[in-house]
């Protein structure tokens, strides 16, 4: 008769490498009497007899987990057990090796040049897959803008134009390589302006061709604005090569004007604008100042204090040897003129000599003055001082307002700009905008077409000059 | 009362874009009236304007440097920057930004101290 | 491009006047700037739109432009005047320039 023996594992476990959807078997062979109850941890949680992932065979010794998964990596261990001794261990690992596989392929990207670029590729493997990614049909270098996360994904910062193609990455291990489909990455470039148009200064009844070159991707679309609104006249010719779309606008001179080119690309559902302006003068109508050069400074006169806004900056010609003097010294003079002429002229006209010889300063990059926008101008000579102003017009002509400096500073109201073409470009008169609610009748020479911020302030059609003259015609 | 300071990298090699930056405390670059230029000085020379972006963010550049130049600005950080391509030791300089004021006929009235540009290999 | 001229250097007398000049094609349809440049500092405006002052800058700085000619003045020049001196006008293209600059000394 068999003495009682304990347990003793002859052939303990060792770490087994399997591979996904293979067979990995433990063999743990035992030696004792009577014979031995033996079962199965992983990770110190018991395997179930009846989970039918694995077979135990051989009286337990012999444990297979039929298809790999990689979530079966563990520790297993098998334990004896006779009632004999105490009960007997042995652990081994199982390491699941796995091909490398992209989880979470790129994908088609659209970007706007200059910002950042990700595209991923998540990937499993044991070993860990390295990532590499091919661009066209070449490896794609790591530099100070590109480079591969530790996740695989691709970063390129800055992204340029010539980033744009076909895109792939490859994971790879020591048991394969795994590549994504082919990617699209599209690099879209703000519109851009290459050529802008150039200023004209010509003579009445000139041809002129102004030409607008721009760049982007989508190729950008041009279009014209005379004045702040679309060009109504004139023709167009427009053409697109290698991305650059070239468009020329022809124009029959009978007025100046400001044309600005407008190129716009889309990308989604934004749009980007990319603008530049000329402006086409006729010569006869420029007034010869000091290139309408002067600086801006806080009005610090008497004369206008009431009817200038507070705070803002008033533009100082320096044609004049002091111009804050010498402007005053006008003001005062066309003052003194003013006592004579009716309640409902003199503040109106006020409100316009003032904002005249003292125009709010443009916040352009070198001082210039804003003049009055037209329909305020027309407003007083034909509203609000007509009788006074048909009086004055014929003094001027007989010579009564000459002083030693200039013509009392009135302006020629069909030469300032209208409010309507580009409201930004002019000066309004709060003054007549109150005022006017208290007009009731209005003279017959106003225009029966309403202007769009005033009601029945007289609409003209009368070119306007950049530059306004100190002249009563 | 405004006050400009510069900085960007002493040391360039040719070949490569410059960037320097300008930032301005005690004023917005958006203010009305103002305008913000890159004015740089060669050893031993004079000034020469580089360019100008306005207080609207338009911009404006020498005729000899405008096909390198270009000049941006983050009005969040209240910063102008300029970047110069394709620079050659002839770039080397004092690089100054300074606010132009139309209250003073646009002139440059507030100046930065200058930062050290070299373009060597 | 818009050139405008500076002679390289102008020595005067402590307390005597020096005038600095700067040419360039019709300059007195521009308005001119100065500004005054000590060694290893930043240029500062001395003379804004031909004539005037900024607050802070010595009654004995003046300026006048006519013609092809503008000059900036210092009556009674003192010893800290010593400095380079650059005029500087924008042109109707929103350009700037500068003048090559003038070395005052003051002996």
């Known amino acids: 008769e068999k003495l009682p023996k304990a347990p003793v594992i002859t052939t303990p476990l060792e770490t087994v490498d399997a591979l996904v959807e293979e067979v990995a078997t433990f063999m743990c062979a035992v030696e004792s009497y009577p014979q031995p109850e033996i079962s199965w941890t992983r990770n110190k949680i018991l395997i179930k007899l009846f989970d039918t992932r694995y077979s135990i065979r051989e009286n337990g010794q012999l444990l297979t987990i039929l298809s790999v998964e990689d979530s079966d990596d563990g520790i297993y261990c098998c334990i004896a057990n006779n009632g004999v001794g105490g009960a007997v261990e042995s652990c081994g690992a199982l390491q699941v090796k796995m091909k490398p596989k992209i989880t979470r392929p790129p994908i088609n990207v659209k970007i706007i040049e200059g910002l950042k670029a990700v595209l991923p590729c998540t990937t499993m493997g044991n070993p860990k897959p390295s990532v590499s990614w091919i661009k066209g049909d070449n490896a794609l270098r790591e530099n100070s803008r590109i480079a591969v996360l530790e996740s695989g994904s691709l970063r390129i910062h800055n992204v340029q134009k010539e980033d744009a193609g076909q895109y792939r990455c490859v994971a790879k291990n020591s048991l394969g390589t795994a590549y994504s489909k082919l990617v699209k990455l599209e690099v879209e470039v703000f519109a851009r302006i290459l050529r802008a148009p150039e200023s004209h200064n010509v003579t009445f009844g000139s041809f002129v061709t102004l030409r607008c070159t721009a760049i982007g991707i989508p190729v950008p679309t041009i279009s014209w604005i005379e004045n702040g609104n679309a060009v109504s006249s004139g023709s167009i010719q427009e053409s697109v090569k290698d991305r650059v779309i070239d468009s020329r606008l022809q124009l029959f001179i009978t007025k100046p004007g400001l044309y600005t080119c407008i190129a716009t690309n889309k990308h989604g559902e934004k749009f980007s604008t990319a603008k530049a302006a000329a402006t086409v003068s006729i010569a006869e109508w420029s007034k010869s100042q000091k290139d309408s050069q002067g600086y801006c400074a806080q009005y610090r006169g008497e004369v206008c204090d009431a009817v200038l806004a507070k705070d803002a900056l008033v533009f100082f010609n320096t044609s004049y040897r002091d111009p804050e003097d010498a402007q005053e010294l006008l003001i005062h003079t066309a003052w003194n003129e003013l006592k004579a002429v009716s309640p409902l002229c003199r503040p109106a006209a006020e409100a316009l000599l003032c904002n005249h010889l003292f125009q709010e300063c443009s916040p352009g990059v070198v001082p210039t003055p804003m003049p009055i926008c037209r329909e305020y101008c027309l407003a007083v000579k034909e509203l609000f001082c007509a009788k006074e102003w048909q009086a004055m017009e014929g003094k001027a002509h007989r010579g009564l307002y000459r002083s030693g400096m200039h013509l009392l500073p009135v302006p020629e109201c069909s030469k300032l700009p209208s409010m309507h073409r580009d409201p930004t470009a002019c000066t309004r008169l709060p003054y007549l905008d109150y005022k006017k609610e208290n007009i009731t009748t209005f003279p017959s020479i106003t225009s029966s077409r309403p202007s769009a911020d005033i009601p029945n302030l007289p609409a003209s059609t009368s070119s306007f000059a950049v530059s306004p003259a100190y002249s009563m015609t | 009362q405004v006050q400009v300071q510069e900085s960007g990298p002493g040391l360039v090699k040719p070949s490569q874009t410059l960037s320097l930056t300008c930032t301005v405390s005690g004023g917005s670059i958006t203010a009305r009236y103002y305008s913000w230029s890159w004015i740089r000085q060669p050893p031993g020379k004079g000034l020469e304007w580089m360019g100008v972006?306005?207080?609207?963010?338009?911009?404006y550049y020498s005729p000899s440097l405008k096909s390198r130049t270009s000049i941006s600005r983050d009005t969040s950080k209240n910063q102008f920057s300029l970047h110069l391509s394709s620079v050659t030791p002839d770039d080397t300089a004092v690089y100054y930004c300074?606010?132009?004021?139309?209250?003073?006929?646009?002139?440059?009235?507030?100046w930065g101290q200058g930062t050290q540009v070299t373009v060597s290999s | 491009s818009y050139e405008l001229t500076q002679s390289p250097s102008v020595s005067v007398a402590l307390r005597r006047t020096a005038k600095i000049t700067c040419g360039g094609d019709n300059i007195g349809s521009k308005n001119t700037q100065w500004y005054q440049q000590k060694p290893g500092q930043a240029p500062v405006l001395v003379i804004y739109?031909?004539?005037r002052r900024p607050s802070g800058i010595p009654e004995r700085f003046s300026g006048s432009n006519s013609g092809n000619t503008a000059t900036l003045t210092i009556s009674g020049a003192q010893a800290e005047d010593e400095a380079d001196y650059y005029c500087h006008v924008w042109d109707s293209s929103t350009n700037a320039w500068f003048g090559g600059g003038t070395h005052l000394t003051v002996l």
């Open positions: 739109a031909d004539s």
């Open positions: 300074a606010r132009g004021s139309s209250r003073v006929a646009a002139a440059f009235d507030s």
């Open positions: 972006i306005a207080y609207d963010g338009s911009t």
